[in-house]
């Protein structure tokens, strides 16, 4: 290898002298842009685990509400690529919950620049019962919420199996499968591909043709027979779910108040909450009309805000 | 419904050999596995190797033939058996045959359709 | 490995009689078994399969049985047409080992 490089300088020099500075030249640009190479992926490294960590953070668990839905019309395809899958997509925004410390209370106001003008003027005097109390209103700091569509995808070609037992070898139970899947008696139908994993227990299986998916999951059950015994597996719909337009927001509210500096009231937290009411009512005391009034005196309350 | 096997021959030991099976009147579907058997001069039946007729195209043999034959579709009507390093034992007429499954669980087969089978002599 | 060990080798009867012949299995095959008639010069012929199911066209004269390895092929009114060899054959799947497909020794009908 070094006698190949001699060869190529001594052809080098044979050219000419210039020639051969020139290549020298290039030859420390190279090692330089090599260096700044190196530097650069290791840069990109750090910032791709800043950012796998940073992705962690925002991952979030949410408990959303069942929601009744409204069927509004029925489509008809245009062609059947459009019958082998169901799809709908759903926009979630989850709702923030802000919990209400004892001593502090939450004001709603119908309009944003009354929520603005009460905490621009921060210290008001609520007079509750004998006593006037020097209250602090304050914006409220929201935790992040988040917003994004699911699109589920169902399809009506293939069928999720499970509970199937593991009593074969992982290519007889391939076949077993395809082969019971196939039985027109059974409901089945020509199968294409099956898709099977011995460590869960699952499959998924492709058939051919469209409609011998919803057949099969007209019983929650499909018999399997292996060696005279029947075990009867479970199916149900082949979904696919995809988070789109997934997004993090964070802010305070417009036209809700914090209020603070309630802690030594020992009363009904429904009568501090109507005189709180009326006296944010009265545009003399920098208020206007109250949406809703949440008042905590003894346990703290969770209070939840939507968009 | 028929079955026909070829490339039956005489052949020297140590040379190769692949036979043909054909389908007429049906192609391969999940209720099937497609086979082959041999019998030598005089002997009983021997099972070879299978191939799984559905879309996994599974294969299995018996524990002798492993690694000297190899079972393949080559079609959805055609089955190749490849055989290497043959010996004078393993001169036979070779048959291909439909091992089909007879319930709706599959759990019950049988070589319900035969070629009439291919002779295969290797001698020196 | 599955094996098939098929009794006797080879039996004589007259015509009109009853002939039984006797496979049993290494292990237990689950009623997965199917008998075979071969004539010289032909590909064998399925008679019963699921060890007591009769194959169509095949006559009732013919009759299997069994359970778990002890399998019978029974042939009563024995015509001249019957004399052959016969095969009990069996394919099991399992969980320790690769799908197996095994034939009898075979068992020789002559008819007098």
């Known amino acids: 290898m070094e006698a190949d490089k001699d060869d190529t300088q001594q052809i080098l020099k044979e050219h000419s002298p210039d020639e051969f500075i020139k290549d020298e030249q290039n030859k420390g640009l190279i090692d330089e842009i090599t260096k700044k190479n190196i530097q650069l992926k290791k840069e990109i490294q750090k910032l791709e685990t800043e950012l796998q960590e940073a992705t962690k953070e925002f991952q979030i668990k949410e408990d959303i509400p069942e929601t009744k839905m409204k069927f509004l019309s029925v489509e008809t395809p245009e062609n059947d690529s459009q019958l082998s899958n169901i799809s709908c997509s759903f926009q979630v925004s989850s709702k923030v919950p802000y919990e209400i410390q004892k001593g502090q209370a939450l004001i709603t106001f119908e309009k944003e620049e009354v929520a603005q003008n009460v905490v621009s003027m921060s210290k008001h005097h609520v007079q509750i019962k004998d006593v006037n109390l020097e209250v602090t209103a304050k914006p409220v700091p929201l935790n992040s919420g988040v917003r994004f569509q699911v699109y589920v995808e169902v399809s009506k070609m293939k069928i999720n199996v499970t509970e199937i037992p593991d009593t074969l070898r992982e290519d007889q139970m391939r076949d077993k499968l395809e082969l019971s899947f196939s039985k027109s008696r059974n409901g089945g139908g020509e199968v294409d591909r099956v898709d099977y994993d011995r460590q869960s227990g699952s499959a998924v299986i492709t058939f051919v043709e469209i409609g011998v998916a919803d057949k099969i999951l007209k019983k929650k059950e499909y018999p399997l027979y292996i060696n005279q015994t029947c075990h009867r597996v479970t199916v149900s719909p082949y979904t696919e779910i995809h988070l789109k337009k997934y997004q993090i927001f964070s802010g305070t509210s417009k036209r809700t108040v914090l209020l603070t500096g309630m802690e030594g009231i020992q009363m009904d937290e429904e009568i501090v909450e109507d005189l709180i009411n009326i006296h944010f009512q009265r545009a003399k005391n920098g208020g206007g009309e109250v949406d809703v009034v949440k008042c905590s005196l003894g346990q703290p309350h969770i209070a939840y805000f939507e968009e | 419904q028929s079955l026909e096997e070829s490339g039956g021959d005489l052949v020297k030991p140590g040379a190769s050999l692949t036979l043909t099976c054909t389908a007429s009147?049906?192609?391969?579907?999940?209720?099937?596995?497609m086979c082959w058997v041999r019998q030598a001069p005089g002997k009983g039946l021997e099972w070879i190797a299978c191939i799984y007729a559905g879309s996994s195209g599974s294969t299995y043999y018996a524990s002798w033939a492993k690694g000297r034959f190899t079972i393949s579709k080559t079609s959805s009507t055609t089955v190749t058996l490849q055989m290497t390093s043959l010996t004078a034992a393993d001169t036979a007429t070779y048959f291909c045959?439909?091992?089909?499954?007879?319930?709706?669980?599959?759990?019950?087969?049988?070589?319900?359709?035969w070629g009439p089978g291919t002779l295969v002599t290797v001698s020196s | 490995a599955l094996v098939m060990t098929q009794t006797p080798s080879s039996v004589s009867a007259a015509v009109g009689g009853t002939v039984t012949i006797n496979c049993q299995a290494s292990q237990n095959i689950y009623t997965n078994l199917a008998w075979y008639q071969q004539k010289p010069g032909q590909p064998p012929k399925l008679l019963i399969y699921g060890a007591s199911n009769l194959e169509s066209g095949v006559p009732s004269r013919f009759k299997g049985s069994g359970s778990g390895t002890e399998y019978t092929l029974t042939i009563s009114d024995l015509e001249c047409d019957d004399a052959a060899t016969y095969y009990c054959?069996?394919?099991?799947?399992?969980?320790?080992?690769?799908?197996?497909?095994?034939f009898g020794g075979g068992t020789e009908v002559v008819v007098k």
């Open positions: 009147g049906f192609s391969f579907s999940s209720s099937y596995y």
């Open positions: 054959q069996s394919s099991l799947e399992s969980r320790i080992a690769d799908r197996a497909n095994a």
């Open positions: 045959a439909r091992e089909y499954s007879y319930d709706d669980y599959g759990d019950f087969w049988g070589f319900n359709l």
